[in-house]
């Protein structure tokens, strides 16, 4: 169908104001532009209201070359004021003006909301010359309009350094409802009420909302947007969506899954990363969280020993990182380790148990009966001790570490010696005369160095002094031993 209206040529075109002469353009081509010399080209809208002349921005032409008469002011003829159309439809609208033939080089440009429309738009200007005037029709077409095409469109014509501006054509694009708020996926407690929100806008308004649960409509009567659906509670997972309806049709929101919170699945892949004598570093892969964030985890440790009482040590830790260092363990012991995690609903089952062992420990006691004496003829110090009574967990004795500190006139020097496990005596060279030598001994296993014995002091005189009296580890409670010569 062609919408066409004819307007007589008048020196002052009637201007009825921006009457909402909008065209519904869903099924019509807006403009047909045949030209016959007997009338002005077709306009989109034939105003029915009483009008008035233009009073605004018009170009006043100069006197003609003959100097005989003035030409009428130039102004665009009034066209449709408002076009309402659906998204994805095509639209075509126009500006028309009659220009006396004395004018040359007229150019028409299209503007939208104050910005010139350049490039990828379909703007066509057609000229229809007559004896005295040329009718100019500038058409603008948009294929498959989008909401972003909404706006106020005007024509501008440059003529003799004058700018003539048309009245605006308001383009209002309507379409299917557009969601401004869609329901969100949620994790809910079983049989507990929750809300879902859906909001959609036009134009056109109003927008009505239907809720859908697992493909079935929830509400028989539509609700005006925005709509809040209160679900009294679920016992199993469900999928919800909302339908937004307006005069143009319906839009369906994304489907969202509503999950029921449950206890987590047990952790998997408990792994040993590092073992020491008294600690084990473990990690695990969390199980499924049951649609509720993990709060914390529990590491359970049982000693694997027929003689142990089978008690379980429990260590609580944060859920992240999925790693924990179990401390305060016995050296050279075997343990069974499991992990369980909890969310707001409860604790998971325990992971599969894994076996882990601690390594040898360092000795827990120092060598006994340490004695020190000076062998002046050889210029060395003899040291003797008794092997400490170490526990099995400390592991096999591999040797001893001897610390000897030499102090003289404000100078102090510490030296360390390592001796094998079969020894229970050692000799060290005198480092400084006229000095005090302080000796301490520690037992060493693969698990590390044990505690040092209490210090034993011996005075090393200047050359020529002789003393064979030993210095030895004191009985408990005595002052530090010092050999006095």
């Amino acid at each position: 169908a062609i919408t066409e209206a004819r307007e007589e040529a008048k020196p002052y075109p009637l201007f009825p104001g921006p009457l909402p002469g909008s065209l519904q353009t869903d099924h019509t081509s807006l403009l047909s532009l045949p030209h016959t010399s007997g009338y002005q080209p077709a306009l989109m809208f034939s105003p029915t209201q009483p009008g008035r002349p233009y009073t605004g921005n018009v170009a006043i032409p100069r006197v003609t070359s003959a100097g005989s008469k003035l030409l009428p002011p130039l102004a665009f003829k009034h066209t449709v004021g408002h076009i309402i159309l659906s998204e994805h439809k095509d639209v075509k609208f126009n500006c028309s003006i009659s220009v006396p033939n004395i004018y040359q080089d007229t150019t028409i440009s299209w503007w939208k909301d104050g910005k010139e429309l350049l490039g990828a738009h379909h703007a066509i200007t057609q000229f229809y010359p007559d004896d005295e005037v040329t009718a100019i029709i500038a058409s603008f077409s948009i294929t498959s309009v989008q909401r972003s095409d909404n706006g106020s469109y005007i024509c501008k014509m440059k003529i003799n350094n004058e700018e003539i501006v048309s009245d605006p054509i308001y383009i209002e694009v309507q379409g299917l409802p557009h969601f401004t708020k869609q329901p969100e996926s949620m994790n809910v407690t079983r049989n507990t009420a929750f809300n879902l929100t859906c909001q959609a806008v036009g134009p056109p308004e109003p927008v009505n909302i239907f809720w859908v649960q697992n493909s079935s409509r929830v509400n028989e009567q539509p609700e005006k947007s925005p709509s809040v659906l209160t679900v009294p509670g679920l016992t199993e997972m469900a999928v919800f969506s909302c339908e937004a309806h307006n005069d143009k049709g319906l839009t369906v929101s994304k489907g969202v899954q509503i999950n029921i919170k449950a206890i987590p699945s047990p952790p998997t892949e408990v792994s040993i990363h590092n073992s020491t004598a008294h600690s084990i570093l473990i990690s695990w892969v969390p199980g499924f969280d049951g649609y509720s964030p993990f709060r914390n985890c529990s590491v359970q440790v049982k000693e694997v020993d027929p003689l142990s009482n089978g008690s379980v040590m429990i260590f609580n830790t944060s859920a992240s990182p999925h790693m924990y260092q179990i401390k305060q363990l016995q050296a050279l012991a075997n343990y069974s380790i499991g992990v369980s995690c909890m969310n707001e609903i409860g604790w998971s089952a325990v992971s599969p148990w894994i076996l882990a062992s601690t390594t040898e420990g360092a000795p827990s006691v120092a060598p006994l009966n340490v004695t020190v004496f000076l062998n002046e003829s050889r210029d060395n110090v003899d040291i003797r001790w008794m092997k400490p009574l170490t526990k099995r967990q400390a592991g096999e004795l591999v040797g001893y570490r001897i610390s000897h500190v030499w102090q003289s006139a404000g100078i102090s020097k510490e030296l360390l010696e390592e001796v094998g496990q079969n020894n229970s005596r050692a000799q060290i060279s005198v480092q400084v005369h006229n000095a005090t030598c302080t000796v301490r001994i520690a037992a060493v296993t693969k698990g590390g160095v044990g505690p040092f014995s209490d210090p034993v002091k011996i005075f090393i005189p200047a050359h020529g002094w002789v003393d064979h009296a030993p210095s030895s580890t004191p009985a408990p409670g005595n002052a530090d031993p010092v050999l006095i010569i």
Partner: antibody, heavy 118, light 112 residues
Framework: QVQLQQSGPELVKPGTSVKISCKAS????????IHWVKQRPGQGLDWIGW????????QYNEKFKGKATLTADTSSSTAYMQLSSLTSEDSAVYYC???????????WGQGTSVTVSS | DAVMTQTPLSLPVSLGDQASISCRSS???????????LHWYLQKPGQSPQLLIY???NRFSGVQDRFSGSGSGTDFTLKISRVEAEDLGVYFC?????????FGSGTKLEIK
Amino acid sequence: QVQLQQSGPELVKPGTSVKISCKASGYSFTSYYIHWVKQRPGQGLDWIGWIFPGNRNTQYNEKFKGKATLTADTSSSTAYMQLSSLTSEDSAVYYCARLGLIYALDYWGQGTSVTVSS
Amino acid sequence: DAVMTQTPLSLPVSLGDQASISCRSSQSLENSNGHTYLHWYLQKPGQSPQLLIYRVSNRFSGVQDRFSGSGSGTDFTLKISRVEAEDLGVYFCLQVTHVPFTFGSGTKLEIK
């Protein structure tokens, strides 16, 4: 966001003229009609007319022809209404409003009170 | 001119009640294109009018869904489903189909 800021209250003498302003912001001033509306104390609303700033075309309600003159300054995005030969009947609050794409007066100025008193 | 007759002049309501305002035009407001340019406004005390409903039934952006409009031709209705304290003020209809544009005389919504 669209805003229309009107000039302050006016106290004028009968027989004189007054010019009130409406400064637009937040949209293309030259692309949308500006309408003017009169509201007398405790009474309804009366449409005065419109101006299209893009080309300064105007349309008046017959009741206000000769009383109101509408102009626009595009460089400052300001519309003006001059009221002449003022009488006590012209004492009112005058609003400017934009005719939006939906062809409704979608945004309004805060109003300018004009009091005509000797 | 298209004369807009609005009723009632005053509408006392209790909060939470439904309110209904009528606007009747002396001539049809349907344009040749089939659209009807009848709008509803609320003017709160000491404020400018604010647009509620445009073209009979379309809610303007930000307007609560309590407000709805209906009608055609010459008879139009604005409904407020559950009146709240912030809804109090004077309601106007406005037609922009015919020049001059004309307003209804206003309906004052007040608490009983």
